[in-house]
């Protein structure tokens, strides 16, 4: 068992844990920019999925000590286009390497305040946090 | 505010919320099998990323009312190989469509038990839960 500071309200509150809920996505620390490196813009024939992909990416750490999970990783695309399946290095302009985003549920540790405003341990504030999961090789969107 | 049954311990306990911690990943409800549909094994020129991808996938809902988040989605690949960038329909055997997995932090609501074993509200049990995020077009692994 591991102990957490209580979210328990003082007497007079309903016997419930307060969990704030917001559907407003929290932006990541940095914009999930593309990060093109011609040297690493290649699809490997071994190694992890993100290096074997024809839309390769790297992961960038986003750490917040008052958030659960404390460590999140944002994908950063290494190429603007997809890498050729044949060569593993030349880019194919017919395919775009696009970031796949996801609004992940996270929890922030916040001070809780009792009825009279006095500090009552910590509460967990539930938020949606936008993370880029991977880079995906897609056909460019054709506008109608 | 959103309310959850309390993690508040009874008198005599430290004024802390108990949170169990396990690093053992929880398997998803169903194995993340491949789900090949020749009819949907094509890369669209519009629509969401998962349908424009040359490794298209669909999402399958995994709902657990005693878990946070309650709803998780598992990617299911629609093709064994990548779809040709040129045609958007024919498969290219030089590329494999592979699932990208991630161990996501989730929380389970569990009954808490007091000193004498009596029920004392709920605790949050933190677990790692394996989810498939997307299907990625990769170069097949070449064994050394």
């Amino acid at each position: 068992y591991s102990h957490w500071p209580s979210c328990c309200p003082s007497k007079g509150y309903p016997s419930e844990e307060l969990l704030r809920w917001s559907t407003v996505p929290v932006p990541p620390l940095k914009p999930a920019s593309l990060d093109f490196h011609s040297v690493s813009c290649r699809a490997s024939e071994d190694g992890p999925l993100n290096s074997r992909a024809i839309s390769p990416w790297r992961y960038e750490l986003d750490r917040d000590l008052n958030r659960l999970p404390q460590d999140l990783y944002h994908a950063r695309c290494l190429c603007p286009h997809c890498v050729s399946l044949q060569t593993g290095s030349h880019m194919d302009p017919r395919g775009n390497s696009e970031l796949l985003y996801h609004n992940q549920t996270v929890f922030y540790r916040r001070p809780c305040h009792g009825k009279k405003g006095n500090h009552k341990g910590y509460c967990l504030e539930r938020r949606l946090y936008r993370v880029s999961l991977a880079c995906v090789c897609v056909r460019p969107r054709v506008m109608g | 505010y959103s309310h959850w049954p309390s993690c508040c311990p009874s008198k005599g306990y430290p004024s802390e919320e108990l949170l169990r911690w396990s690093t053992v990943p929880v398997p998803p409800l169903k194995p993340a099998s491949l789900d090949f549909h020749s009819v949907s094994c094509r890369a669209s020129e519009d629509g969401p990323l998962n349908s424009r991808a040359i490794s298209p996938w669909r999402y399958e809902l995994d709902r657990d009312l005693n878990r946070l988040p309650q709803d998780l989605y598992h990617a299911r690949c629609l093709c064994p190989h990548c779809v040709s960038l040129q045609t958007g329909s024919h498969m290219d055997p030089r590329g494999n469509s592979e699932l990208l997995y991630h161990n996501q932090t989730v929380f389970y609501r569990r009954p808490c038990h007091g000193k004498k074993g009596n029920h004392k509200g709920y605790c949050l049990e933190r677990r790692l839960y394996r989810v498939s995020l997307a299907c990625v077009c990769v170069r097949p692994r070449v064994m050394g």
Partner: antibody, heavy 125, light 107 residues
């Protein structure tokens, strides 16, 4: 016991690249982040970046953007730090340091709990 | 980036003395502070993490305190083997940053 053993001293010309290795033993290599810190002669410690050996995830100081590449080889429990386009002011001792996590789960605290012996990199024409 | 200012930059004390080193952050770092010891041969060891928790094997004469932006490392009774340079480091936010160091000498 935990040990981090670094590669030997290097002498490089300006514009060249250097790759320093750090072999870990005595613990689960993929379970701990590895930091890279440098120290120019008579100067203070400067954090360069870190890498998670499990997924290759990194973070680095902005001033090293585009010049530093941190990698790992899980099969031999070794971390690498490559610095390119070397300048004379990159002359320093380069350290790898394991990042331990402490305190009440799930809100951890982080500290560089074990350090390599350091690798002197001299950049000179 | 968070700036860490350490003082004094050097100090000389006698064996048995009580020694205090201070570290000031450019913003509140919520006790997310570590202290390290660098011996003259370059060897670096973790002394204290999270402001005041002693790392395994560190003698109890070392202690840490502080909050907000101001932190202190104290050696209650200086020993000859404590000759070293001491650094504070914040881990409140990436990038991590170190103080300028305090070189401790024996009189």
């Amino acid at each position: 016991q935990v040990q981090l053993v670094q590669s030997g001293a290097e002498v490089k010309k300006p514009g060249a690249s250097v790759k320093v290795s750090c072999k870990a033993s005595g613990y689960s290599f993929t379970g701990y982040t590895m930091n890279w810190v440098r120290q120019a002669h008579g100067k203070n410690l400067e954090w360069m970046g870190l890498i998670n050996p499990d997924n290759g995830g990194t973070s680095h100081k902005q001033k090293f953007q585009g010049r530093v590449t941190m990698t790992v080889d899980k099969s031999i429990s070794t971390a690498y730090m490559e610095l390119s386009r070397l300048r004379s002011d990159d002359t320093a001792v380069y350290y790898c340091a394991r990042e331990g996590y402490y305190g009440p789960s799930p809100f951890h605290h982080y500290a560089m709990d074990y350090w390599g012996q350091g690798t002197l990199v001299t950049v000179s024409s | 980036d968070i700036q860490m200012t350490q003082s004094p930059s050097s100090l000389s004390a006698s064996v048995g003395d009580r020694v205090t080193i201070t570290c000031q952050a450019s913003q509140d770092i919520s006790n997310y502070l570590n202290w390290y010891q660098q011996k003259p041969d370059g060897t670096i060891k973790l002394l204290i993490y999270y402001t005041s928790t002693l790392h395994t094997g560190v003698p109890s004469r070392f202690s840490g305190s502080g909050s907000g932006t101001d932190y202190t490392l104290t050696i209650s009774s200086l020993q000859p083997e404590d000759i070293a340079t001491y650094y504070c480091q914040q881990y409140s936010k990436l990038p991590y940053t170190f103080g300028g160091g305090t070189k401790l000498e024996i009189k």
